[in-house]
């Protein structure tokens, strides 16, 4: 039950995180004009990964896409790549984790397969979260560097009559959304990995004992008794008839009402 809860919660947290990463990637406010000593501005600039926008005092907002690919800074391209990789990995992770959920039964999928899928999706979520955090952090670092450079420029060469005041940019809302979303995806991934440990079958090293009867040759392989004793309902007990010509599951694990959280 705790395993199902951990897995389910990991999935939900990752889902929210990936939705946040997608939202952050699409948002226009990665960097916003620094209003330092003037809280109200006639022209407010803000920029995203895909376009830059200007909001005028009337409320009119105009956005222009970055229609060049080669002319963009390498750092911006790197951030774009990291965010897209994060989204793709997260989306694949979500797809895998849906089939890995313990509360969803698909045919006669073994729990060991579900465990592997849970681990795979967990790792994907972790990498996805790290990509998002890395992307946002790279962009934030770029902003900090540019901020201090433009601040230095503002206070140099002011001897002349005409001043060219550079627009300084500071952290936009998308950065905080990205950091939080990346963190959630990472946490979700860790939870999936933890859930995987609980799902994985624990093999016991009992020696198989053969009982020879006069008429039939039936081999009993102990290990399935864990199911009845409650030590691990995931292990299958195989009875081998006629030299293993046909197998059937003796113990089926049905979800109990407590598994639905």
């Amino acid at each position: 039950m705790a395993v199902t809860a951990c897995q389910g919660l990991g999935f939900v947290v990752s889902l929210i995180g990936i939705a946040g990463i997608i939202a952050a990637t699409c948002m226009d406010q990665w960097s916003t004009q620094d209003l330092y000593n003037n809280p109200v501005t006639a022209v407010f600039n803000y920029q995203g990964l895909w376009r830059s926008c200007v909001r005028e005092s009337s409320g009119f907002t105009e956005c222009r896409g970055y229609f060049t690919l080669l002319g963009l800074p390498a750092m911006l391209q790197a951030v774009r790549a990291l965010m897209i990789v994060g989204i793709v990995l997260g989306a694949i992770g979500l797809l895998v984790s849906i089939f890995a959920l313990k509360c969803i039964r698909i045919g006669s999928m073994e729990d060991s397969a579900k465990a592997n899928m849970t681990l795979t999706s967990g790792i994907m979520f972790i990498v996805s979260g790290l990509c998002a955090i890395a992307g946002v952090s790279v962009f934030a670092n770029m902003l900090v560097t540019n901020f201090w450079m433009s601040t230095a420029n503002m206070y140099t060469g002011m001897g002349g009559m005409v001043q060219t005041v550079q627009t300084r940019y500071t952290f936009g809302a998308a950065l905080f959304v990205g950091w939080v979303a990346g963190g959630l995806t990472l946490i979700g991934g860790v939870m999936m990995c933890i859930a995987c440990r609980g799902l994985a079958p624990e093999e016991t090293n009992y020696k198989a004992v053969s009982y020879h009867a006069s008429g039939h040759s039936v081999a009993y392989k102990p290990g399935g008794f864990k199911a009845s004793t409650g030590f691990g309902s995931n292990t299958k007990n195989k009875k081998i008839y006629d030299g293993g010509a046909r197998t059937e599951d003796e113990v089926q694990s049905y979800p109990s009402k407590h598994d639905y959280v």
Epitope: V40, V54, S57, F60, Q163, T164, T167
Partner: antibody
Framework: QVQLVQSGAEVKKPGASVKVSCKAS????????MLWVRQAPGQGLEWMGN????????YYALKFQGRVTMTVDRSTSTVYMELSSLRSEDTAVYYC?????????????WGQGTLVTVSS | DIVMTQSPYSLAVSLGERATINCKSS????????????LAWYQQKPGQPPKLLIY???TRESGVPDRFTGSGSGTDFTLTISSLQAEDVAVYYC?????????FGQGTKVEIK
């Protein structure tokens, strides 16, 4: 058509207050910022501040802060500008003007002006 | 505050001749975000409120005759009346529309020679 109609001329004594109104018609009143600009006799134009009729948010020029109050009455599509502690140098024609949407912060329509004379 | 300086103070031009008014700002009115200049030109005739002629330094307001042309970028701007008409006699103002507080030039009076 867009019209901004202002209240009539006022004569005030120094230290008094004046309240000028500006009634808008011909457009969606809450969609456009309203600005106040004054012009002393024979002088140039001076921006005093603006008001967002939708939120009622105001922004005043530093020179007038503490003395000017801009308010809005959405039910009558009217904005008001009140200037207190009047001095002789406040004698001017006061204009309300609309900030034209998508016009790079330019003022596309103006009221006819209200002459405020401050004299003892 | 951005200081707007217009020149000349007054201008006398013959009918049909070209009139040129200059406006210089103490700070750039160019916005890199959208590559636009935030400068407006107004015409004010005696006893009337100002009338918008040009916004964004070069875009003519609807209904304004095409003899009025705005040009310039950054800190230096020009309003040109290609062929002066009798009804163009007025005072012309440039306005900083980039930063609060909005500021105006002192005005240029255009008369007929």
């Amino acid at each position: 058509q867009v019209q901004l109609v202002q209240s009539g001329a006022e004569v005030k004594k120094p230290g008094a207050s004046v309240k000028v109104s500006c009634k808008a018609s011909g457009y969606t009143f809450t969609d456009y910022l309203m600005l106040w600009v004054r012009q002393a006799p024979g002088q140039g134009l001076e921006w005093m501040g603006n008001i967002n009729p939708y939120y009622g948010r105001t922004y005043y020029a530093l020179k007038f802060q503490g003395r000017v109050t801009m308010t809005v009455d959405r039910s009558t599509s009217t904005v008001y500008m009140e200037l207190s502690s009047l001095r002789s140098e406040d004698t001017a024609v006061y204009y309300c003007a609309r900030d034209g949407y998508s016009l790079r912060n330019a003022m596309d329509y103006w009221g006819q002006g209200t002459l405020v004379t401050v004299s003892s | 505050d951005i200081v707007m300086t217009q020149s000349p103070y007054s201008l006398a031009v013959s009918l049909g001749e070209r009139a040129t008014i200059n406006c210089k700002s103490s700070q750039s009115l160019f916005n890199s975000g959208n590559q636009k200049n935030y400068l407006a030109w107004y015409q004010q005739k005696p006893g009337q409120p100002p009338k918008l002629l040009i916004y964004g330094a070069s875009t003519r307001e609807s209904g304004v005759p095409d003899r009025f042309t705005g040009s310039g970028s950054g800190t230096d701007f020009t309003l040109t009346i290609s062929s002066l008409q009798a009804e163009d006699v007025a005072v012309y103002y440039c306005q900083n529309a980039h930063s609060y507080p909005y500021t105006f030039g002192q005005g240029t009076k255009v008369e007929i020679k």
